[in-house]
C-alpha cells in the first residue's frame, strides 16, 4: 500500500493532524524533499554570519561570514577571524609568525620555511613572515665550469592543444 505522504512535494509536509494531507510549510521553514512529515526551521544568519542565500519553502538559508572573518566547517558552521598575511590566529588573537615560519593567507597557520638543503638546493630568496623561501640550484650547480643543462619542455596533458 502506497504511503499517502509520498505524494507531498518539497515545500510541503504530510499533516497528520489533517488526515495526512499535504500542507504548505509555513514561513521560516522548509522541506527540501518530498514525503516529509515536518518542515525544518530555516537557518538564521545572525551576528558574524550573513545571509548568502535566503531561505525558501524548499531550501534552507545559506550563510557566509561578514568581512574580516572566514567560514569554517561544513556549510559554514563557524566564522573565524581573519588575520593578516604573516600572522596566525591564536587564543590571544592574531600573532606574527615566529622566525622561520610564514603564512601567505589571511587564515590558516604559520608553516615552516622550506628547507632547501633537503633537496640539495640553496636558498635563492630568503623567507619572510609572509613568504616562503625560494630555493635555487644546488651550490654545486653554481660552481665555475658546471655545465648548463636545458630543462626538458613540460609534458602536455592529453587532449589539450597548445594555446
Amino acid at each position: 500500500l502506497q504511503d499517502p505522504c509520498s505524494n507531498c512535494p518539497a515545500g510541503t509536509f504530510c499533516d497528520n493532524n489533517r488526515n495526512q494531507i499535504c500542507s504548505p510549510c509555513p514561513p521560516n521553514s522548509f522541506s527540501s524533499a518530498g514525503g516529509q512529515r515536518t518542515c525544518d526551521i530555516c537557518r538564521q544568519c545572525k551576528g558574524v554570519f550573513r545571509t548568502r542565500k535566503e531561505c525558501s519553502s524548499t531550501s534552507n538559508a545559506e550563510c557566509d561570514c561578514t568581512p574580516g572573518f572566514h567560514c569554517l566547517g561544513a556549510g559554514c558552521s563557524m566564522c573565524e577571524q581573519d588575520c593578516k598575511q604573516g600572522q596566525e590566529l591564536t587564543k590571544e588573537g592574531c600573532k606574527d609568525c615566529s622566525f622561520g615560519t610564514f603564512n601567505d593567507e589571511e587564515h590558516g597557520v604559520c608553516r615552516p620555511w622550506t628547507d632547501c638543503s633537503l633537496d640539495g638546493k640553496s636558498v635563492l630568496v630568503n623567507g619572510t613572515k609572509e613568504r616562503d623561501v625560494v630555493c635555487g640550484p644546488s651550490p654545486a650547480d653554481l660552481s665555475p665550469g658546471a655545465s648548463s643543462v636545458t630543462p626538458p619542455a613540460p609534458a602536455r596533458e592529453p587532449g589539450h592543444s597548445p594555446q
Epitope: 510541503t12 504548505p24 514561513p27 521560516n28 530555516c42 535566503e54 525558501s56
Partner: antibody
Amino acid sequence: QSVEESGGRLVTPGTPLTLTCTVSGFSLSTYAMIWVRQAPGKGLEWIGVVYDNGYISHATWVKGRFTISKTSTTVGLEITSPTTEDTATYFCARSADGSWSTYFNLWGQGTLVTVSS
Amino acid sequence: DIVMTQTPASVEAAVGGTVTIKCQASESISNYLAWYQQKPGQPPKLLIYKASTLASGVSSRFKGSGSGTEFTLTISDLESADAATYYCQTNYCCSSSDNGFAFGGGTEVVVK
C-alpha cells in the same frame, strides 16, 4: 511577464466581491504574490500574501475581512463583506524570487473597488 | 505585525538638491527593507531592496542605507521626474510578531 488585476466595480456594502490577479509569463509555483490596497489619496496598505508553496498569510488587521486563494494562473482576493472603508485601488504584485523574505518588483496597474449604498 | 514609521510626510526641495527620507521599524528587521516610488495613477515601482541594493534600471542618484530599525533613502541631484510619493516596506518574513510586508505611511517629494 505580467500581472493584471480585474473584478473591481461598484458594490453595495455587505455584497461579497472577488478580485482576480491573472499572471502570464511565469509560474505561481515559483513566486509569491501579494495584495496591496490604496484608498483614494492615502498610502499603501498590505493585505496578504500567498507564497510559492501555497501558504497564505494575512495582515493582522484583516481579521476575516479578506480571503486569498490561488489557482495555477490566478490569485484571488475576496472581500467578504465590503464596507465603505474598503473603497480603494487594489494592486497585485509578484515577488522577485521564491524566498520567504522577498520583495516585489512586478506590479499590476490595479483595479478600483467602490463600496457605496 | 511590524509597524513602519516614515518621516517626513512631505518634503520640498529644488532641482539639483538632496532629499532624505527616514523609515523606522518597530523591531529589528536586519536589512529586509525595500523602497518604492509611486506617481499618481501608477503602481509602485521598486527602487531599492535589501536596504541598499539598487533595483535594475534605477538611477544611482537613489541611495538606501541602514539596518536593524533605522533606514534612510537619499535622493541626490534632484530632478523634476523625482516628484512622487516614496514608501518603505519591510520584507522580513519571520518576525516575532508574525510575518509581514507592512508599508510606511509614505513621503511626498515636491520638486520646485
